[in-house]
Interface confidence: low
């Protein structure tokens, strides 16, 4: 007869490991007992359990409560045992010794490998601002046994760099993602992907990129100069900009206070029926936590009685 076992048994941390040992004998042969021991190189054998055909399972004190027989039905030629709740320290070489009648004793070895799945963490880098050079967007760290793979999944252009630290029973891998911040990256996901043989599927942690910026400001509403005449209703100026964080708007008049009846509604300046009092230089001030911008326009309200052309001056300043 001969013993059937596995060269390597792989189990995830915390799971139960089945240590296989089956005697495939000739007709009429019987197994008297099966002894299991741990036999790591350089150390003496440490008994786990003894499985006796007549007296059942005896577990050594060091493994009390952790070694069991597989659930029924059981084959009398099967000397396999279950090692409950595998921990990293269980990783190593194991030997089963089978005493048979009348063929004698047989032994076989296997290696138990305990996978420690990583618990990845993602740390965003410093605040991203448009105009910065190559900047750390995020770093992702995962520690496990064996060493996990850490990669990035994103549509954003950037560069990655990885480093690994080996510990006695595991390895920590850190990957950094660097980019040159631009406003088009706002809201884009940057996903750290961690692969490991102990994971059923890749673990993914997503960081949403937020790049502070403020676009140049401009004012709309003066495109048709002839509309800005005395008595016109519904005239308005609209300040155009965009930013992250979303900006706030403020309107002032450069050559005095805003005329009475002029309505400020966020980015829009609404005028009552136009009079010559509404002529002047208006400034839209756009700001967010990152920056501020100004845009000024000159409004010249036409008097239809006079045949004078209206002049419009547009100036943008940062």
């Amino acid at each position: 007869g001969e013993l059937e076992t596995s060269d390597v048994v792989t189990v995830v941390l915390g799971q139960d490991a089945k240590l296989p040992c089956f005697y495939r004998g000739d007709s009429g042969e019987q197994v008297g007992q099966v002894a299991w021991a741990r036999v790591d190189a350089g150390e003496g054998a440490q008994e786990l359990a003894l499985l006796h055909s007549k007296y059942g399972l005896h577990v050594s004190p060091a493994y009390e409560g952790r070694v069991e027989q597989p659930p029924p039905p059981r084959n009398p030629l099967d000397g396999s045992v279950l090692l409950r709740n595998a921990v990293q320290a269980d990783e190593g070489e194991y030997e089963c010794r089978v005493s048979t009648f009348p063929a004698g004793s047989f032994q076989a070895r296997l290696r138990l490998r305990v996978l420690v799945p990583p618990l990845p963490s993602l740390n965003p880098g410093p605040a991203l601002e448009e105009g910065q050079g190559l900047t750390l967007a995020a770093s992702c760290t995962a520690e496990g046994s064996p060493a996990p793979s850490v990669t990035w999944d994103t549509e954003v252009k950037g560069t990655t760099s990885s480093r690994s630290f080996k510990h006695s029973r595991s390895a920590a891998v850190t990957s950094e993602f660097h980019l040159v911040p631009s406003r088009s990256m706002n809201g884009q996901p940057l996903t750290c992907v961690v692969s490991h043989p102990g994971l059923l599927q890749d673990q993914r942690i997503t960081h949403i990129l937020h790049v502070s910026f403020l676009a140049e400001a401009s004012v709309r509403g003066l495109e048709d100069q002839n509309l800005w005449h005395i008595g016109r209703e519904g005239a308005m100026l609209k300040c155009l900009s965009e930013g992250q964080p979303p900006p706030s708007y403020n309107w002032t008049r450069l050559d005095g206070p805003l005329p009475s009846g002029v309505r400020v509604d966020g980015d829009t300046l609404g005028f009552p029926p136009l009079t010559t009092e509404h002529s002047g230089i208006y400034v839209c001030h756009v700001s967010n936590e990152f920056s501020s911008r100004d845009s000024q326009v000159t409004v010249d309200v036409l008097d239809p009685q006079e045949d004078s052309g209206k002049q419009v001056d547009l100036v943008s300043a940062s």
Partner: antibody
Framework: QVQLKESGPGLVQPSETLSLTCTVS????????VHWIRQSPGKGLEWLGV???????DYNAAFVSRVTISRDNSKSQVFFKLNSVQADDTAVYYC???????????WGQGTTVTVSS | DIQMTQSPSSLSASVGDRVTITCRAS??????LAWYQQKPGKAPKLLVY???NLADGVPSRFSGSGSGTDYTLTISSLQPEDFATYYC????????FGGGTKVEIK
């Protein structure tokens, strides 16, 4: 005009997989993100995940082990799978469109899914 | 995840009333907030994004304001078609929604 329409079985057995399809028209799924959101009386509106214009996916951490989102660009379809469903997965499931941000400018009409034996 | 707390959960109002709904985030969301309107049996409809920007086709009686953690949706003069449930939603990271505010006829 922009339209999204969800389809799939209205009844799913507990522990089975819920599979839904979102068919879109009026825009290209290679230019916009398509998200899945569900709504139930007990939990309100919950964002489940997204497949972005480039094909990458992101999932709500609470569902990451159970959700898979994929797509067929040629058919303008996005597919949603939720494994190991239980009674508390009973909800109206919506697909919705976004740009690069996570706000949703167009929604499907929703499809009611009941998990029951 | 960031939690969104919406108040009130319901309110009664009359046509022509000014209605204010508030939403508080558990941390700064930097104006990355949207508001939606939902009517029974229908999908939510985007009203406001980035806290203050009105979505296309939304009447000007709707407006959004706020910054940091506190945000407000205002309906300046309630119309019959405005009776619905309103939700806020942040998009600063994994999106989450508020619990909703049901606006009912008084």
């Amino acid at each position: 005009q922009v339209q999204l329409k969800e389809s799939g079985p209205g009844l799913v057995q507990p522990s089975e997989t819920l599979s839904l399809t979102c068919t879109v028209s009026g825009f290209s799924i290679t230019n916009y993100g398509v998200h899945w959101i569900r709504q139930s009386p007990g939990k309100g509106l919950e964002w489940l995940g997204v497949i972005w214009s480039g094909g990458s996916t992101d999932y709500n951490a609470a569902f990451v082990s159970r959700v898979t989102i994929s797509r067929d660009n040629s058919k303008s379809q996005v597919f949603f799978k939720l494994n190991s469903v239980q009674a508390d997965d009973t909800a109206v499931y919506y697909c919705a469109r976004s740009g690069k941000w996570y706000y949703f400018d167009y929604w499907g009409q929703g499809t009611t899914v009941t998990v029951s034996s | 995840d960031i939690q969104m707390t919406q108040s009130p959960s319901s309110l009664s109002a009359s046509v022509g009333d000014r209605v204010t709904i508030t939403c508080r985030a558990s941390e700064n969301i930097y104006s990355n907030l949207a508001w939606y309107q939902q009517k029974p049996g229908k999908a939510p409809k985007l009203l406001v994004y980035a806290a203050t920007n009105l979505a296309d086709g939304v009447p000007s009686r709707f407006s959004g304001s706020g910054s940091g953690t506190d945000y407000t949706l205002t309906i300046s003069s309630l119309q019959p078609e405005d009776f619905a449930t309103y939700y806020c939603q942040h998009f600063w990271g994994t999106p989450t929604f508020g619990g909703g505010t049901k606006v009912e006829i008084k």
